[in-house]
Amino acid sequence: APSCPQNVNISGGTFTLSHGWAPGSLLTYSCPQGLYPSPASRLCKSSGQWQTPGATRSLSKAVCKPVRCPAPVSFENGIYTPRLGSYPVGGNVSFECEDGFILRGSPVRQCRPNGMWDGETAVCDNGAGHCPNPGISLGAVRTGFRFGHGDKVRYRCSSNLVLTGSSERECQGNGVWSGTEPICRQPYSYDFPEDVAPALGTSFSHMLGATNPTQKTKESLGRKIQIQRSGHLNLYLLLDCSQSVSENDFLIFKESASLMVDRIFSFEINVSVAIITFASEPKVLMSVLNDNSRDMTEVISSLENANYKDHENGTGTNTYAALNSVYLMMNNQMRLLGMETMAWQEIRHAIILLTDGKSNMGGSPKTAVDHIREILNINQKRNDYLDIYAIGVGKLDVDWRELNELGSKKDGERHAFILQDTKALHQVFEHMLDVSKLTDTICGVGNMSANASDQERTPWHVTIKPKSQETCRGALISDQWVLTAAHCFRDGNDHSLWRVNVGDPKSQWGKEFLIEKAVISPGFDVFAKKNQGILEFYGDDIALLKLAQKVKMSTHARPICLPCTMEANLALRRPQGSTCRDHENELLNKQSVPAHFVALNGSKLNINLKMGVEWTSCAEVVSQEKTMFPNLTDVREVVTDQFLCSGTQEDESPCKGESGGAVFLERRFRFFQVGLVSWGLYNPCLGSADKNSRKRAPRSKVPPPRDFHINLFRMQPWLRQHLGDVLNFLPL
């Protein structure tokens, strides 16, 4: 057979050949960082001629062109500078909001050498919608400007940019947009391993956390997750072995998959791993139906036995058949376990597709994904049971659109990636599941099912009491620390008499713990402003209790997520590099933020935290309280910016004994403490011995009810000072 000509140099770059100059060989160009090859590749045809994939005109000279990042097409409620058609590598774009709008995301973004912007999409939001303004990523055009429940927004990319993420998103009942943020990217762009590893890792860790909401430490094995329930994960690894993958690259695919297997088994969750290689046809090397799929050594051994030559007779890329073999495996397992059994329905499934190109035979891979979604009953409500990661390697013939179509779409997560080469892939798998970075206690997990007990719904909730009567409430923020209010401890300091009652699955009365030490904010002094006519002042009303023993994590005892920590960052599924400010913008993102506290009887009550201008009018009412503040001239002397304010309209008000308890909100089915109950103008339990009876304030009451809660975002220095070695704090 004729060989292809060798005059294929690229000025300023280099090239590699998959099979020399022979027909079927793929020539791949590469350029220094900040440049991209045009064309990216050529294929040696049986005629002895080079063909450029997708090219319409005859062979052009290969050149390295400068990478550029896409420009904003529109930016709502603000301005950006400089205004260019596209931006060079290293170039910045800055965003500012109009009055009345708050900037969420990155105020300044830089164009990176891979043609991608750093940071997060900048959005100017006034918090008016049911869902936050979803923004418009750079290079995108959005239609739809209403953000109420059920409203939809649609995105498309300008000019020749490719959309990854969701082209349509719907505002859901929980105030979160469906799908994942759309990003417009240059067709030649790719992802850096240092971005992919945490993105993949965050998503995977979230899935592992969902597979295993209750974990326990095995000291000898360091920080590892151990399944305590019936949760099970099926992991399907699909390795492209088509003609365009060189033997060396296939070896790296195998090594990367081995790393993944090794890492996933180190989590000690119940996992079964399937291994499938594919070209024109799939070859199942390990099925989840095989008991050996639960044995790490067997799985790795089957990977090692994967042979590049297994597919030499069929060299196309049949991604449909590979995914369909996963579907058939699922179908068989469903029949084996029984369609309606918990054993089948509670399995979570993760598919990792490693490919170097677009499918070029068989059916549409998307249809195979549809079949998989159908058999697993995946819909918006059961989205957690399936994750498909589509990873393209070698930015030559990888089809962004196809990868994006196959990858799962989940809010705050990415499932489709393109890496420059197999070395980058290896790096990703090495770093994506760094067990040491995962804490033993997954925070903010409450049981939301209708038949759960109050304590299972809010397992962080604790009662703090002296020998006699109950006084205060608090929240577990780790397995040994409780966050509460300082004013609970103003009557005497002998904590040896105090007890902390923590939830316990074995007893409806909970379990009592002694206090090893109480750290009370030195700034707290209820009489600090007496001489100004302020009879009681609750600034710095915050305290930490270290329990004498560690609490055993269970369905009834589990810490709540504290914002501004890595633990909360993982639960929020935010990217690495997020800051405390980012958490505040995400959690307190509206003028009126729905939140909760726990009542004396253990039930969860609703309040609305007022922010911005609504905070001012909420706090203003204090000036009408003449008994406690007889000659108050400035409300801010009493209600400093340390406080969150609630108690308007239909809000419940906390009772006296509920002080110190968490003020928390729910995001992505996880719970985050943003405040703690401190003081208020009305006690709904006054004069009632019954824990279940609360009296609403009469409408005519002057002043009307108002409640103030210590804002944890304003107490960061103090929290960091005392919890620095307990929790992993993010930069401010």
């Epitope: 369609m339 059916g363 998307k366 249809t367 979604r373 819909n379």
Partner: antibody, heavy 125, light 106 residues
């Protein structure tokens, strides 16, 4: 507006095949977003889904377990219709047979938004 | 196999609210829809994706779905609402219909 018009015999002898056709107007049988199903209804067993066909770069067919071995659904793109063939019928197969347009459960559309007028098929000698 | 159970019949006075339930294991994890069928006619979709109404369906029809139960509510029931109502969901490899509820407007 989508309309489905059914045709076929109202009486079939036991052990014979039952053949029905559903003509589509206002949509295409090879649409990339629709699925085309056959459903039947009898007083004893209520509504039962029998099977579906749909096109996504190639044709796919799915059948209910209880009729899988004797049922075929065929699309006909030239006439923009699809047909049902149920072999070896018994009196148990006596029912009103409907064709219907649905979406993909995978796309959160597991319902039928258009139905044919229905044909009562009696299996009797 | 998966089953959806409905009460066989329900009587309601004009102007009153009729609530029809549909029970199935973890039905709340699936999307439920509802069909209305009048004698001699084909079923008509009245609710899809738990609580959405197709165009042309009156606002008095509403739906909800959580836990093991989906509910179709007809508020201010009218004489022309007298019909059989069926719930339906998808389960892994098949479409499943409810047993049907006959609603009589007194």
């Amino acid at each position: 507006q989508v309309q489905l018009q059914q045709s076929g015999p109202g009486l079939v002898k036991p052990s014979q095949p039952l053949s029905l056709t559903c003509a589509i107007s206002g949509d295409s049988v090879s649409s990339n977003s629709a699925t085309w199903s056959w459903i039947r209804q009898s007083p004893s067993r209520g509504l039962e889904w029998l099977g579906r066909t749909y096109y996504r770069s190639k044709w796919y067919h799915d059948y209910a377990v209880f009729v899988k071995s004797r049922m075929t659904i065929n699309p006909d793109t030239s006439k923009n219709q699809f047909s049902l063939q149920l072999n070896s019928v018994t009196p148990e197969d006596t029912a009103v047979y409907y064709c219907a347009r649905g979406g993909m459960p995978a796309s959160d559309i597991p319902h039928f938004d258009n139905w044919g007028q229905g044909i009562l098929v009696t299996v009797s000698s | 196999s998966y089953e959806l159970t409905q009460p066989p019949s329900l009587s309601v006075s004009p102007g009153q609210t009729a609530s029809i339930t549909c029970s199935g294991h973890k039905l709340g994890d699936k999307y439920a829809c509802w069909y209305q069928q009048k004698p001699g006619q084909s079923p008509v979709l009245v609710i899809y994706q738990d609580n959405k109404r197709p165009s042309g369906i009156p606002e008095r029809f509403s739906g909800s779905n959580s836990g093991n139960t989906a509910t179709l509510t007809i508020s201010g029931t009218q004489a022309l609402d007298e019909a059989d109502y069926y719930c339906q969901a998808w389960d892994s490899i098949t479409y499943v219909f409810g047993t049907g509820t006959k609603v009589t407007v007194l």
